[in-house]
Interface confidence: medium
């Protein structure tokens, strides 16, 4: 049978031929009668056999990491007969490992993100190196990890390659670190090979910084003419954090929030100071407000960094705007009696300059020839007034600043002209009537009424009487109806057209004014010849046709 030991050949042998071992048949007595042959992959090129002795040699340098074993076949032939002495047999040549490969990190590049301020021991990332040498051959592929760069912030577990935080880091001081990890084989013993890798460790932001105002004092100005909602300026706080952690909200401390407000521009992270209520330079010419700023999002566990909000003081100066004069009243109503003499006092208006300068004021009345106004605001009449022509005047008073004539204010002025009893009552129309020749005594021939152009505080009351001469020798009499009308009656029986064709009766009408005024009004009465039918009358000078009163033709 075949006789051999297990064959090993060390890799990376530099000699031209290296004896591996011997293949031998136990029938071989050493007299060179047998011939040994080598078959299979590598036979003749990598391995050769001494045909006489069966010694095997490696004639090439081998690399275990390329090929760790060779399976060959052996034959032994009797030279004399040419026949196989032994059956063909397979055998194995193993390439034994030497430490000729350094550890390699195959998953490069390494990058990790870890929150800033993470506690010691926090896992960052695991790096893994691999060694092509034989793990079963001693310590050639047994690795140890160590940190070449990254202390004191990081550490690496020697056997696992797990990188952990060993000291708290502040992103605001440094936001990324390069850590260099070395892997050594031979568990670090002399002769070990090593490989390194770099790990980029980025710190993610946590909200460990509160926003702080850049300035402890801001100065802003606002015009007193500015409408509510006007932006009067911006304030700015800075937060060393980034992103959402740097978003902030501005506000005004409660006591100061009557007149101003602060809104936050979330794009620029600025605070915009807004006018909440109109300001008046003359009332208050400056304001002081305290503003504060806080982060928008603060997790509960980070509140310790945000205990006291940053504050700033804002000085706001109100800028004076020249304002038009201000009348004491929104409008004025005065009364003056009619017929008062020119230059009579009507009333006084007053306007003042609301500005601190207190400019003198000049007054004028627009479109009026009836009233005057002086620089003191005193209004007088420039003509006599007649209530019966105009009972009310709707005017406009203008006040102008003496030193700035562009500053003008106008308000309505209403003047009521009060009545005096300067008109006597008179017939409400022209009265002309007739009496028949055959009229009897006490016959009603006309009802009369009166009007008075004056205004009466109470109702008008008129008193009707005949004049003294008519009372004494009149053919007619009058009865006052006590309702501002009176009736005229015949005072005799029978009239003569030829003798006396027309009568003119003087009627006195008095009013109830104080003093009372009386007018004399003439009533014309024609004497007519009335037929029995009474429908047509023939009178001297003209024919009077009776129909719903009289129509003269």
């Amino acid at each position: 049978g075949w006789v051999w030991n297990q064959f090993f050949v060390p890799e990376e042998m530099n000699t031209t031929s290296h004896h591996i071992g011997q293949l031998r048949s136990d029938l071989d007595n050493g007299n060179n009668s047998f011939q040994y042959k080598l078959l299979g992959a590598g036979a003749g090129s990598t391995f050769i056999i001494d045909e006489r002795t069966g010694d095997i040699y490696a004639i090439q340098k081998l690399d275990r990491e390329e090929r760790s074993l060779y399976i060959l076949r052996a034959q032994v032939i009797d030279i004399a007969t040419g026949r196989a002495v032994e059956p063909e047999s397979e055998f194995v040549i193993k390439v034994s490992d030497i430490n000729d490969n350094e550890p390699k990190f195959l998953d490069e590049p390494y990058e990790a993100i870890v929150p800033e301020m993470s506690p010691e021991g926090t896992l960052v990332i695991q790096v893994t190196a691999s060694d092509a040498d034989d793990p079963s051959s001693g310590n050639n592929a047994r690795l140890l990890y160590s940190l070449l760069q990254g202390q004191p912030y990081f550490s690496v577990e020697p056997t696992t390659g797990v990188i952990r935080i060993s000291s708290k880091m502040d992103r605001e001081l440094q936001d990324e670190y390069w850590v260099i990890i070395q892997a050594k084989d031979m568990i670090g013993q002399p002769g070990a090979l090593s490989g390194t890798t770099s790990v980029l460790i980025k710190l993610s932001d946590v909200n460990d910084n509160k926003p702080i105002f850049k300035e402890s004092l801001y100065r802003l100005t606002v015009s007193e003419s500015a409408p509510t909602g006007t932006s009067i300026g911006t304030i700015m706080a800075y937060d060393n954090d980034i992103g959402e952690n740097a978003e902030m909200d501005y506000s005004i401390e409660e006591d100061d929030s009557q007149t101003f407000d602060i809104i936050t521009n979330h794009e620029t992270q600025e605070g915009i100071v807004i006018l909440k209520k109109k300001v008046d330079f003359e009332h208050q010419n400056h304001y002081g407000i305290r503003a504060k700023v806080k982060n928008h999002h603060v997790p509960e566990q980070l509140m310790k960094y945000h205990t006291e909000a940053s504050t700033t003081f804002i000085k706001i100066q109100v800028e004076d705007v020249d304002e038009p004069p201000l009348f004491l009243l929104p409008y004025y109503v005065f009364e003056v009696f009619e017929e008062t003499p020119q230059g009579s006092f009507v009333g006084v208006v007053s306007a003042t300059d609301p500005d601190n300068r207190k400019s003198p004021i000049r007054y004028s009345i627009t479109r009026s020839k009836v009233f005057n106004i002086n620089d003191n605001g005193t209004i007088t009449t420039s003509n006599s007034l007649d209530r019966e022509i105009s009972a009310w005047y709707n005017l406009s008073i203008t006040a102008t600043e003496k030193y700035n004539i562009e500053q003008i204010s106008s308000i309505p002025l209403y003047v009521q002209v009060l009545n005096i009893n300067d008109h006597a009552p008179e017939f409400s129309q022209y009265y002309e009537t007739y009496v028949c020749e055959n009229a009897g005594s006490g016959q009603v021939i006309q009802t009369i009424s009166a009007v008075d152009r004056d205004e009466s505080i109470e109702e008008h009351h008129f008193y009707f009487n005949l004049s003294v001469e008519d009372t004494n020798n009149s053919s007619f009499t009058i009865i006052d109806n006590q309702d501002n009308t009176a009736v005229i009656l015949t005072n005799r029986t029978g009239f003569n057209l030829q003798e006396e064709p027309v009568f003119y009766i003087s009627i006195l009408i008095a009013d109830n004014g104080i003093p009372s005024l009386t007018s004399t009004n003439t009533l014309t009465i024609h004497v007519c010849d009335c037929g029995d039918s009474g429908s047509t009358q023939t009178c001297q000078y003209q024919e009077l046709v009776l129909s719903m009163g009289f129509k003269t033709e």
Epitope: R219, G288, R290
Partner: antibody, heavy 119, light 107 residues
Framework: QVQLVESGGGVVQPGGSLRLSCAAS????????MDWVRQTPGKGLEWVAV????????YYADSVRGRFTISRDNSKNTLFLQMNSLRVEDTAVYYC????????????WGRGTLVTVSS | EIVLTQSPGTLSLSPGERATLSCRAS???????LAWYQQRPGQAPRLLIY???SRATGIPDRFSGSGSGTDFTLTISSLEPEDFAVYYC????????FGQGTKVEIK
């Protein structure tokens, strides 16, 4: 040390002019709003004028507006008050005063300089 | 403008006594913008109290301020010899106006 020192006071006739100066030292002058305040036996303390830290805004009491001008030279740490058309009632001790950073009260005053307006 | 009226005009007290000075405004002083100053003869005024009740830097705690709106008080709990002086109140909420002063003199 931190101090304000006024100068330039004196006797002047009505209608005349005078220029007061106030030298600041020991603090960052250019960071503070500065004021002039005067004191008369009759009216007591009366605020006169203010100028903002950078000179950008100036405001005056009604009694002096149009006659007095406040100015400053931050490079020389000096505050000025130019007084024209002086009246008898302007007679007073004039103080320069520093406004605090967060308000309008005065945390630092000079010793004052006397201005007498008399014919 | 806001007019400040101080009372009494003169306060005669002995060292160690308590002094209470009053300052009344003609209209409400916004946000308690009121200060107190001390003026010794021949010297410039010195800030004591601001914001109605906050003591200025270096001011002894025997000085205290109180009040809001229109009525304010300066209290000196126990008078020291150097406290005999004139005291002024000042409002700085609407322009700048001062009271006419209260003289604290030795009895």
């Amino acid at each position: 040390q931190v101090q304000l020192v006024e100068s330039g006071g004196g006797v002047v006739q009505p209608g005349g002019s005078l220029r007061l100066s106030c030298a600041a030292s020991g603090f960052s002058f250019s960071s503070y709003d500065m004021d002039w305040v005067r004191q008369t036996p009759g009216k007591g303390l009366e605020w006169v004028a203010v100028i903002w830290y950078d000179g950008s805004n100036k405001y005056y009491a009604d009694s002096v507006r149009g006659r007095f001008t406040i100015s400053r030279d931050n490079s020389k740490n000096t505050l000025f008050l130019q007084m024209n058309s002086l009246r008898v009632e302007d007679t007073a001790v004039y103080y320069c005063a520093r406004e605090t950073g967060e308000g309008w009260y005065f945390d630092l005053w000079g010793r004052g300089t006397l201005v007498t307006v008399s014919s | 403008e806001i007019v400040l009226t101080q009372s009494p005009g003169t306060l005669s007290l002995s060292p160690g006594e308590r002094a209470t000075l009053s300052c009344r405004a003609s209209q409400s002083v916004s946000s308690s913008y009121l200060a107190w100053y001390q003026q010794r003869p021949g010297q410039a005024p010195r800030l004591l109290i601001y914001g109605a009740s906050s003591r200025a830097t270096g001011i002894p705690d025997r000085f205290s301020g109180s009040g809001s709106g229109t009525d304010f008080t300066l209290t000196i709990s126990s008078l020291e010899p150097e406290d005999f002086a004139v005291y002024y109140c000042q409002q700085y909420g609407s322009s700048w106006t001062f009271g006419q002063g209260t003289k604290v003199e030795i009895k």
